[in-house]
Every structure is written in structure tokens, then in C-alpha cells.
Interface confidence: medium
């Protein structure tokens, strides 16, 4: 596929990413997919820097991540290392709650009010961040 | 047992502040959400206000925003609401009521409430 | 914000009937949905929450069921301790917002 060397119309450049930031809340799952139709995937934080710059995007609201544990170990969506890279949890998190009465544990990851992550019930309609690399191959056909 | 009881209430003239709190015993009062929701004479329950386990995040309704202000001194075991500027309309019974986890996962335990009547 | 609507707002019934009370989200709120029980001039009690889980302590005679936008409570044999006017509440999103209560009154 072609290589893409600019961001999409409304997504937001950095560190040669390209960020797109939701105005409006779904579930982790339909957040995910979300950003895989746009060639791109939930937002993978691996460094202090990158999560103070979405950190000041999103603001003071529950925002989903691409980070989950719903087959077990702790994975980011793009196969980023977890245990190895960057963490900025909440105190006590992640902690897995089965108390909430809501059926199964909390298997995703979110930036919570203070750009911390907690990890939550994976229906809430959260909103979401996507990113996708520049200089990488994009999935499309190369025009002929 | 778990038991959460209010006190501050009381009657006090428009614009005027008043300061309630909520005394929390029998549970771990650091790990739990803490809410305040009050009641106008004869009328439904409205949710006014929420704070995380630890204090770092607050919620409130639009009718209070900006004029209450919620906090916590989990040393204390202690749930506060700091009432400014008060109108008729925020006469009521408050109650405190904790969260069944951090913070977002609704109401489970109530205290009997106090009453602040906004009056002059 | 989401709106919650309670139907009947009152009902009147007799020891031993069965009660149906609804409430209605203006948007979907999967199962994030809590009853309360308030008797006159006391706080409220929590029955249910997650739309059908028991709270602690709560006889078996409360029941609640529902998903997404509709949600029911049912007293299954309504006794004299039951007459109390009835709330539900969301929890999917801030601001929580409570139904406008079912007041259950003796026929």
C-alpha cells in the first residue's frame, strides 16, 4: 500500500502520528472498530510525553483507550509491549471490579478526569481517541 | 454497620453559604465514591453532586454548578458540601449516600439527611 | 442529559397484589439503571441495581428486569411494609438523574 506522509482532514499531527479526537461516547468494542475503519486504531500511550499531549486534547472527560484485558494479560491494540512500556494508572488500578453487579470484570483502559487510566466495565459509551502512524503503509489499494 | 449521617443544615438567608457534612463509619470510607442528593419539600429525589474515592474528581448537577462545591477528608472520614450563594430553590432535605465502588456505579447506602430551608 | 420517566406516577392496590412500575430512559443505558424505596419523611432505600441485581438485604418479593431504554420493578406480593413511593435512577453518565416516582398507595 501507499505510504501516508500527511494526516487526514480534522486529525491532529504529532511525534509523525495523527490523532483524532471524539466529541461523542461509545462502547470500547464500537470505539475500536471505529478507528480500524479509519485506517487507524484506539490511541497506544508509550511515553509520558504522548500521554501530557492527549492528555490536553481530551480534557477533563472518560475517554477510551487501546488498551484492554478482555482475553486475559494486558495487551495495546497495535501489539505494543505492555509490561515493558509506558503506565500511568490510577492508584489501586487496574483492579478488575466485579462489584458494580453489571456482569463480567472491567476490561479496558481509560484516561480518567486527571489523564490517569482506570480500568472500567467495557459497555460504558465512552469517548475515544484514534491515532494512526505517519510514513506508514495505509491499508488502500495504490492508485493505478 | 455502615452508617453515614449528615449535619450543617439549617435555616439561612438567600446569598448566603452554609457548609454540610457527613460523617461516615462502619466501611472503608477512602475506597468509595461519596454522592450528596437532595429532596425539595414534596417534590422527587435530585442528584447534586458526586466526588471519587480519592477526592481527585468531581461531578455536579448544572442547577449547582459553580456555586457548590463537594470535597473529602478521608482522614476524617468526613463528606462535605460547601453551599455559596443559596436561593429559595435550593431548599431541601440533603442527603449523603455512598457510591457502590469509586465513583460511578450508583447509590447503595443513604444517610437520613439534613434540612436546609433558604429563606428571609 | 438523560431523562428518566416513571410510569404510573401513582397507583393504588391491595395487600397480596402483584405491582408493575416502569421507567423509560430517553436514551440507551444498557443495564446501568438502580430502584429505591422511600417511605414518608425517611431517605431512601436501594432494592435494585443493575437493573436486576438484589441489593444485600432486600426480600426476594422486589424483582426488576429491563435493558437499553425500558425497565421494569415488580413487587410480586405487595404486603403493608411495601406502600412507599418508588424511584429509579441511571448511572450510565454524570448527571445521575432520577425518575419522578411511583407513589404505591393502599386501595
Known amino acids: 500500500g501507499s505510504e501516508r506522509t500527511c494526516c487526514p482532514v480534522n486529525w491532529v499531527e504529532h511525534e509523525r502520528s495523527c490523532y483524532w479526537f471524539s466529541r461523542s461516547g461509545k462502547a470500547w468494542a464500537d470505539a475500536d472498530n471505529y478507528c480500524r475503519l479509519e485506517d487507524a486504531h484506539l490511541v497506544v500511550v508509550t511515553s509520558w510525553e504522548e500521554q501530557k499531549f492527549v492528555q490536553r486534547h481530551i480534557g477533563p472527560v472518560n475517554t477510551w483507550m487501546g488498551l484492554h484485558d478482555q482475553n486475559g494479560p494486558w495487551k495495546w491494540v497495535d501489539g505494543t509491549d505492555y509490561e515493558t512500556g509506558f503506565k500511568n494508572w490510577r492508584p489501586e488500578q487496574p483492579d478488575d471490579w466485579y462489584g458494580h453487579g453489571l456482569g463480567g470484570g472491567e476490561d479496558c483502559a481509560h484516561f480518567t478526569d486527571d489523564g490517569r487510566w482506570n480500568d472500567d466495565v467495557c459497555q460504558r459509551p465512552y469517548r475515544w481517541v484514534c491515532e494512526t502512524e505517519l510514513d506508514k503503509a495505509s491499508q488502500e489499494p495504490p492508485l493505478l | 454497620q455502615v452508617q453515614l449521617v449528615e449535619s450543617g443544615g439549617g435555616v439561612v438567608q438567600p446569598g448566603r453559604s452554609l457548609r454540610l457534612s457527613c460523617a461516615a463509619s462502619g466501611f472503608t470510607f477512602s475506597s468509595y465514591g461519596m454522592h450528596w442528593v437532595r429532596q425539595a419539600p414534596g417534590k422527587g429525589l435530585e442528584w447534586v453532586a458526586v466526588?471519587?474515592?480519592?477526592?481527585?474528581?468531581?461531578h455536579y448537577a448544572d442547577s449547582v454548578k459553580g456555586r457548590f462545591t463537594i470535597s473529602r477528608d478521608n482522614s476524617k472520614n468526613t463528606l462535605y458540601l460547601q453551599m455559596n450563594s443559596l436561593r429559595a430553590e435550593d431548599t431541601a432535605v440533603y442527603y449523603c449516600a455512598r457510591d457502590r465502588g469509586v465513583g460511578y456505579y450508583g447509590l447503595d447506602v443513604w444517610g437520613q439527611g439534613t434540612t436546609v430551608t433558604v429563606s428571609s | 442529559d438523560i431523562q428518566m420517566t416513571q410510569s404510573p406516577s401513582s397507583l393504588s392496590a391491595s395487600v397480596g397484589d402483584r405491582v408493575t412500575i416502569t421507567c423509560r430512559a430517553s436514551?440507551?443505558?444498557?443495564?446501568?439503571l438502580a430502584w429505591f424505596q422511600q417511605k414518608p419523611g425517611k431517605a431512601p432505600k436501594s432494592l435494585i441495581y443493575a437493573a436486576s441485581s438484589l441489593q444485600s438485604g432486600v426480600p426476594s418479593k422486589f424483582s426488576g428486569s429491563g435493558s437499553g431504554t425500558d425497565f421494569t420493578l415488580t413487587i410480586s406480593s405487595l404486603q403493608p411494609e411495601d406502600f412507599a413511593t418508588y424511584y429509579c435512577?441511571?448511572?450510565?453518565?454524570?448527571?445521575?438523574?432520577f425518575g419522578g416516582g411511583t407513589k404505591v398507595e393502599i386501595k
Open positions: 466526588i471519587w474515592y480519592d477526592g481527585s474528581n468531581e
Open positions: 435512577q441511571h448511572y450510565l453518565t454524570y448527571p445521575l438523574t
Open positions: 436514551q440507551g443505558i444498557s443495564n446501568y
